[in-house]
Structure formats: C-alpha cells, structure tokens
Interface confidence: medium
C-alpha cells in the first residue's frame, strides 16, 4: 500500500507512517514504528502540556511571584497551566497577569472613563474623533482638540487620538 501523506486527527506523520499524538498531560518519549505504538510519559510535578502533542518536553507551570504582588488563583495540573492573580486591592496589568498595579493607567490614545476605586480597576476608553490623550495616565480623560477657529487660526496639522491639532496663522493673501 501507498505510504500515507496525511493522518487522522490526533495523529502525526513521521517516516511515512501515522503515529498517535500524546494526550494532554503527557510528552513524547519515542515515535511509533511499524511494530510499536507511540511512547508517551506523564509530565512531571510542576509541568504541563495542554494539547494533543508530540513535544519531547513539558512546559513549566507559571510562577506567581509574590515579589510582583502575584498569588495562585488556580493551581496548575499536568494538563493546565497555573493561573495567577494579584493580591487583594491590586489589579493585573494584562490578561496573562504577569504583574500587578494598584490601578491601571490608560495608554496614549485612551482616556479614563472611570477612576479606580478600592474594588474596581481603572476603566479606559478610546479617545473618539475630536479628542486626544498623549499621556499614560490613571486619571486623565481624553482632551478635546484645540479649536483653531475660536483663536482666529487655521488647522495646520490634523489631530489624532494621541495628538492635538496644530494651529497656524490664516493665509492673508487674496487672489
């Protein structure tokens, strides 16, 4: 029979042969042969693999570093990574929760919709057209673009969500 060019789900192609992938929580020790099955071994105490795989090494569980204000929210298993969260009163800086802030800042281009409280973090919102924020701040709202017209000036450079408009003198020349 012809050697396969593709394999079924949860299999992989090696040496013109379809081998079974290792199940989550296990790593590959040796590929299958014509006569033997794929050999897999469970991940160690602080390791995991969360997919059907052919990895020869398991991934280390995430370390929730207390020096960064982190603590374990959910202990990892052989099939799942550890999930970290922040100490009470602190907030994760990202979805991955790799560090903690007392309250998050809104990046340039975003303004504060709601200042943080003891229980809720800063709520940011994108600056809409006509408004900008050029700072990273836990407090500042989006500022409106300067109105050149009210100063009897014209727009020399358009504003963005991160920059104010640049005003300049009107061209006094008349045809």
């Amino acid at each position: 029979p012809e050697p396969p060019t593709a394999c079924r789900e949860k299999q992989y192609l090696i040496n013109s042969q379809c081998c079974s992938l290792c199940q989550p929580g296990q790593k590959l020790v040796s590929d299958c042969t014509e006569f033997t099955e794929t050999e897999c071994l469970p991940c160690g105490e602080s390791e995991f693999l969360d997919t059907w795989n052919r990895e020869t090494h398991c991934h280390q569980h995430k370390y929730c570093d207390p020096n960064l204000g982190l603590r374990v929210q959910q202990k990892g298993t052989s099939e799942t990574d550890t999930i970290c969260t922040c100490e009470e009163g602190w907030h994760c800086t990202s979805e991955a929760c790799e560090s903690c802030v007392l309250h998050r800042s809104c990046s340039p281009g975003f303004g504060v919709k709601q200042i943080a409280t003891g229980v809720s973090d800063t709520i940011c919102e994108p600056c809409p057209v006509g408004f900008f924020s050029n700072v990273s701040s836990a407090f500042e709202k989006c500022h409106p673009w300067t109105s050149c017209e009210t100063k009897d000036l014209v727009v020399q450079q358009a504003g963005t969500n991160k920059t104010d408009v640049v005003c300049g003198p009107q061209d006094r020349l008349r045809a």
Partner: nanobody
C-alpha cells in the same frame, strides 16, 4: 537608576499639619504623573493622591479630599503632600510612587503618626 526619597513624617497631634516631600532622581521627573500612597499598620496599601506631570491636574482619595494638597516643583524634581486636619486614621507609612506597579519605583516611605 530611579530613586525616590520621602521625608517630613513624624508624630503629630490630631488636627495638626505635616508636609511630606519626595526627592526624585534617575528619570525625567516632569514627564510623569506622580502619586502618594500609604499603608496603615496591619492594612493594605491605599492610594492617597496623584498629580499630572505638568502639575495642573490633581486627584484625591475621598478620605483625604479637602484636607490634603498634592503639589510638585519640576525644577527641583520634588513632590509634596501638605496634610492638614490630621486624624488618627491618617497614621501610616507614606510612599511616593512614579508608577503604581507593585513596589516598582517606590520610595522607602516616611512614617506619619497621628496621636495625642
């Protein structure tokens, strides 16, 4: 290297006043929003006040509004906190902070004790 050094703490009677200072170095001071936070004995960290880089906008926790005033002198790279009408519940170690990451770019703090 970022350094923040607080001073001005001490023992004061209820109703009294203190002025805290924070000398900053190692970064362009005027570019950054600065904060005061405090930790009361046996309690968590509490944000107190913040000020914009240019010093024009100030923000306060409800617990200190009307009693504390934050200010800065960018020419001296110094942050201030004027504390009036002090109460026993204001007793804490006060820290100035450049950013509110968990103890990242924080000073060592200055102890304020309000007691009769």
């Amino acid at each position: 290297e970022v350094q923040l050094l607080e001073s001005g703490g001490g023992l004061v009677q209820p109703g009294g006043s203190l002025r805290l200072s924070c000398a900053a170095s190692g970064f362009t001071f005027g570019w950054y929003e600065m904060q005061w936070v405090r930790r009361a004995p046996g309690k968590g960290l509490e944000w107190v006040s913040a000020i914009s880089g240019d010093g024009y906008r100030t923000y306060y926790a409800d617990s200190v509004k009307g009693r504390f005033t934050i200010s800065r002198d960018n020419s001296k790279n110094t942050l201030y906190l004027q504390m009036n009408s002090l109460r026993a519940e204001d007793t804490a170690v006060y820290y100035c902070a450049k950013e509110l990451l968990y103890f990242d770019y924080w000073g060592r703090g200055t102890l304020v004790t309000v007691s009769s």
